[in-house]
Interface confidence: low
């Protein structure tokens, strides 16, 4: 039996700058039961704290709730792996919440074929921002991207929607069934996952003629 291998903190993400979660990969366990603890201190402080919540983020994770999350202070964190033979430590990881935001996917994706009498027909796509994000304060700017493709096609067609929460698409293949998804990202941070796909049948008489 050996002391445990070196763990690695490989990812930290925040859904909204108010909370965040970090995940680590355990090293080898040295053939013995191994306990993991995450400790951290804030920039300029020497007092160490233990992870406030090992449950919410799933296995090998640490979740920082609202009361533990500060925008203005860098977190310096480390994972300690301990078994009967000894302890091993991850490299220290420096986390600034501003740069790890990954929102939840947009909600309430609605897709509709519009065929006005006097204009070209189009596909109208509408969605809502994720609930955890409060856009009214101006604290967040969310950007959106739409992707769609005929059901049996391999390639996605991608449209950047900017900050708007609805979008029109004119060029579509009549008679095809399309999959539509939307995702979002903050001005600094990561794209969300794609929303669940919404399906829409394009009528056979959908025409692009003037």
């Amino acid at each position: 039996q050996l002391p445990p291998g070196k763990p690695e903190i490989f990812k930290c993400r925040s859904p909204n700058k108010e909370t965040f979660t970090c995940w680590w990969r355990p090293g080898t366990d040295g053939g013995l039961p191994t306990n993991y603890s995450l400790t951290y201190h804030r920039e300029g402080e020497t007092l160490m704290h233990e992870c406030p919540d090992y449950i919410t983020g799933g296995p090998n994770s640490c979740h920082f709730g609202k009361q533990y999350t500060s925008m203005w202070r860098t977190y310096i964190m480390m994972v300690n792996a301990t078994n009967q033979m000894g302890s091993s430590f991850s490299d220290e990881l420096y986390v600034d919440v501003t740069y790890i935001v990954q929102p939840d996917p947009p909600l309430e994706l609605a897709v509709e074929v519009k065929q006005p009498e006097d204009r070209k027909p189009y596909l109208w796509i509408k969605w809502s921002p994720p609930t955890l994000i409060d856009l009214k304060t101006g604290w967040f700017t969310l950007l959106y991207e739409i992707r769609l493709k005929p059901e049996k096609a391999a390639e996605w067609e991608i449209h950047f929607a900017g900050q708007q929460t609805e979008f029109k698409i004119l060029s579509l293949h009549p008679g095809q069934k399309y999959l539509v998804q939307v995702r979002c990202k903050p001005d600094h941070g990561y794209w969300s996952a794609w929303s669940p796909a919404t399906f829409i049948q394009i009528p056979s008489d959908f025409t692009m003629n003037d």
Partner: antibody, heavy 118, light 110 residues
């Protein structure tokens, strides 16, 4: 006594360079984030740059980004500010300040300042 | 132009109470701690209030800070001649990733 002492200021031509130093004493320098703040003659305070205790996190004001470089030598208890491509608008008294450990983001100790004239 | 807005001047007579305001936005005062600094003529700034309303040791309890929404204020009661100075508010700005200061308020004791 906790003290910060800046040096390296002086008169420099536009486009020139200067390196400011800030010698710290009376506290464990390597445990604290450090900052540079400047004050143009007759004007208010302007934050310039910050560096974390281990130099892993560094921030700059947009007005100096790409021209100024903050660094520190924890073994010498010294903070530096390398200023390149200096402009007339960089003329100011430059203060170094300590990031307050328990004091919620405050700059709790300030040096006496060093004057840079471009 | 400063990100945080302060009145350029304020005045009062000895013994009076004076308040200095500091207005910001959701990305600085609205979501982070406010700090106040005092700068006496010809000297370096000195920390006066941190964490919205906390006084470092050595600062008289005549000085108090408060914060509401995206604004903050510094109150000085029992004004004294030695309080004549420039006062600056400051906060971390999460959108700019840096500290922002108010333009400063020159306090005159009449």
């Amino acid at each position: 006594e906790v003290q910060l002492l800046e040096s390296g200021g002086g008169l420099v031509q536009p486009g020139g360079s200067l390196r400011l130093s800030c010698a710290a004493s009376g506290f464990t320098f390597s445990s604290y984030a450090m900052h540079w703040v400047r004050q143009a003659p007759g004007k208010g305070l302007e934050w310039v740059s910050s560096i974390s205790s281990s130099s892993s996190s560094i921030y700059y004001a947009d007005s100096v980004k790409g021209r100024f470089t903050i660094s520190r030598d924890n073994s010498k208890n010294t903070l530096y500010l390398q200023m390149n491509s200096l402009r007339a608008e960089d003329t100011a008294v430059y203060y170094c300040a300590r990031g307050g450990g328990q004091q919620l983001g405050a700059f709790d100790i300030w040096g006496q300042g060093t004057l840079v004239t471009v | 132009q400063s990100v945080l807005t302060q009145p350029p001047s304020a005045s009062g007579t000895p013994g009076q109470r004076v308040t200095i305001s500091c207005s910001g936005s959701s990305s600085n005062i609205g979501s982070n701690f406010v700090t106040w600094y005092q700068q006496l003529p010809g000297t370096a700034p000195k920390l006066l209030i941190y964490g919205n309303n906390n006084r470092p040791s050595g600062v008289p309890d005549r000085f108090s800070g408060s914060k509401s929404g995206t604004s903050a204020s510094l109150a000085i009661s029992g004004l004294r001649s030695e309080d004549e100075a420039d006062y600056y508010c400051a906060a971390w700005d999460g959108s700019l990733s840096g500290w922002v200061f108010g333009g400063g308020t020159k306090l005159t004791v009449l």
